[in-house]
Interface confidence: low
């Protein structure tokens, strides 16, 4: 990923001082990935190169909300996905019992203070078992192929970060709107495993992007907004970022 960051830098991604209000961080993702039907996959994003604090991470599949990891309230999985989505590891998301319909774009949306919102994109392709097995036989680690893949991934990261809206993170209307739009008709948030509401666990004392809404809603008010959905906590989520 160092090469990724170098490429991003080389292509002139804005790296302004924090006090200017400009967004300085970058999102690293697992890029384009494939998995076998019926199997599982881990979606991972990583925010780096910023001293902003993370308040919430949303995982979305195209126009559907999959999960939220909130600093104060912990993990929350959309009822539509609770049987097949597991929180973690870290701020990642594990998709289980994959179907071909799971093929598509997935987005990790980092709400941070004071930078604003960072969005990472992952494209998942779910392959039929035979195709996956066939593909595995031909995964020869050719340097050229790896380099090409790296360029594709980095370009995707560059585009995603560059096009991320300047809008600030965790606006109330934004969160409320997302949940109403993407969870319309859902009676409640059902936890995949019962656990008490947990505040974010500080996973790493790194100077960049740390756990914390240094911009978002407070616990009480998030409950106010999410009570429509009987918002329940799945437990702790760990916010951490490294400088890149």
């Amino acid at each position: 990923m160092r090469w990724c960051l170098l490429l991003i830098w080389a292509q002139g991604l804005r790296q302004a001082p924090l006090a200017s209000g400009m967004m300085t961080g970058t999102i690293e993702t697992t890029g384009n990935i494939s998995a076998e039907k019926g199997g599982s996959i881990i979606l991972q994003c990583h925010l780096s190169s910023t001293t902003a604090q993370v308040t919430q991470v949303n995982w979305e599949q195209q126009d559907q909300l999959l999960a939220i990891c909130n600093a104060d309230l912990g993990w929350h999985i959309s009822p539509s996905f609770k049987d097949r989505v597991a929180p973690g590891p870290g701020l990642g998301l594990t998709l289980q019992s994959l179907t071909v319909n799971d093929t598509g774009e997935y987005f990790c949306i980092y709400h941070t203070y004071p930078d604003g919102t960072y969005t990472g994109r992952i494209f998942l392709e779910v392959l039929e078992s035979s195709v996956a097995e066939h593909g595995a036989r031909f995964q020869i680690p050719l340097l050229g192929a790896m380099a090409a893949t790296l360029v594709v991934i980095c370009t995707a990261v560059i585009v995603v970060v560059a096009l991320t809206r300047k809008k600030k993170a965790l606006r109330i209307h934004s969160v409320e709107g997302d949940l109403r739009r993407k969870s319309a008709g859902q009676e409640e948030w059902s936890p995949s495993a019962p656990s008490p509401p947990g505040s974010c666990v500080q996973a790493e004392a790194a100077p960049a992007g740390l756990c914390g809404e240094q911009r978002g809603e407070d616990c009480a008010e998030l409950h106010d907004y999410f009570n429509v959905l009987s918002y329940r906590s799945l437990g702790n989520c760990s916010f951490f970022t490294e400088t890149g």
Epitope: D72, P114, G212, E213, Q214, E221
Partner: antibody, heavy 115, light 107 residues
Framework: QIQLVQSGPELKKPGETVKISCKAS????????MNWVKQAPGKGLKWMGW????????TYADDFKGRFAFSLETSASTAYLQINNLKNEDTATYFC????????WGQGTTLTVSS | ETTVTQSPASLSVATGEKVTIRCITS??????MNWYQQKPGEPPKLLIS???TLRPGVPSRFSSSGYGTDFVFTIENTLSEDVADYYC?????????FGGGTKLEIK
């Protein structure tokens, strides 16, 4: 419930130092940045800067660089504003306010600087 | 730095009347404007946050609109309890800047 409780009023002489505290309760202190706002008597509000309550890294507005210092005592969920070499124009009420929306505020600490 | 120009500086209305306060910013701030009410001897209270979003528990007679550089805060059917100073705050970029304030009085 969420509360920010600030230290009491201060009367200081020019050249002295003051340290104002802001104790947070009802939420995870290190999850939310703390802003500081100045309000001179009969005047409007002025943002002084904020401190990242996880890393302790402060950011100061231009008018508050030099004599002003934000600090933390994380174990006590407390943020501090220290003003050195006090001047008459520092006479004001100082507020701590949680994160960018400034949705929760301390009650304010009135600082009077007079010789 | 984004400067915020708030007007009027003061106004006096009869109860039941409509109040309109305007804030104009020197740069485009999308909809990153917040509105506060401050009563004497109290800290400011957030009424409306970014995106013209009314905060929980705030009466619906308060509203706001605007995007870019021009923002309007409205109180419909003003009550005597609305007597206070009102401030706008742009939270689009640092340093965050407040408007100069509007003192609302009841005739």
């Amino acid at each position: 419930q969420i509360q920010l409780v600030q230290s009491g009023p201060e009367l200081k002489k020019p050249g002295e130092t003051v340290k104002i505290s802001c104790k947070a309760s009802g939420y995870t202190f290190t999850n939310y940045g703390m802003n500081w706002v100045k309000q001179a008597p009969g005047k409007g509000l002025k943002w002084m800067g904020w401190i990242n309550t996880y890393t302790g890294e402060p950011t100061y507005a231009d008018d508050f660089k030099g004599r002003f210092a934000f600090s933390l005592e994380t174990s006590a969920s407390t943020a501090y504003l220290q003003i050195n070499n006090l001047k008459n124009e520092d006479t004001a009420t100082y507020f701590c306010a949680r994160y960018e929306y400034f949705d929760y505020w301390g009650q304010g600490t009135t600082l009077t600087v007079s010789s | 730095e984004t400067t915020v120009t708030q007007s009027p500086a003061s106004l006096s209305v009869a109860t039941g009347e409509k109040v309109t306060i305007r804030c104009i910013t020197s740069t485009d701030i999308d909809d990153d404007m917040n509105w506060y009410q401050q009563k004497p001897g109290e800290p400011p209270k957030l009424l409306i946050s970014e995106g013209n979003t009314l905060r929980p528990g705030v009466p619906s007679r308060f509203s706001s609109s605007g995007y870019g550089t021009d923002f309007v805060f409205t109180i419909e059917n003003t009550l005597s309890e609305d007597v206070a100073d009102y401030y706008c705050l742009q939270s689009d970029n640092m340093p965050y800047t407040f408007g100069g304030g509007t003192k609302l009085e009841i005739k």
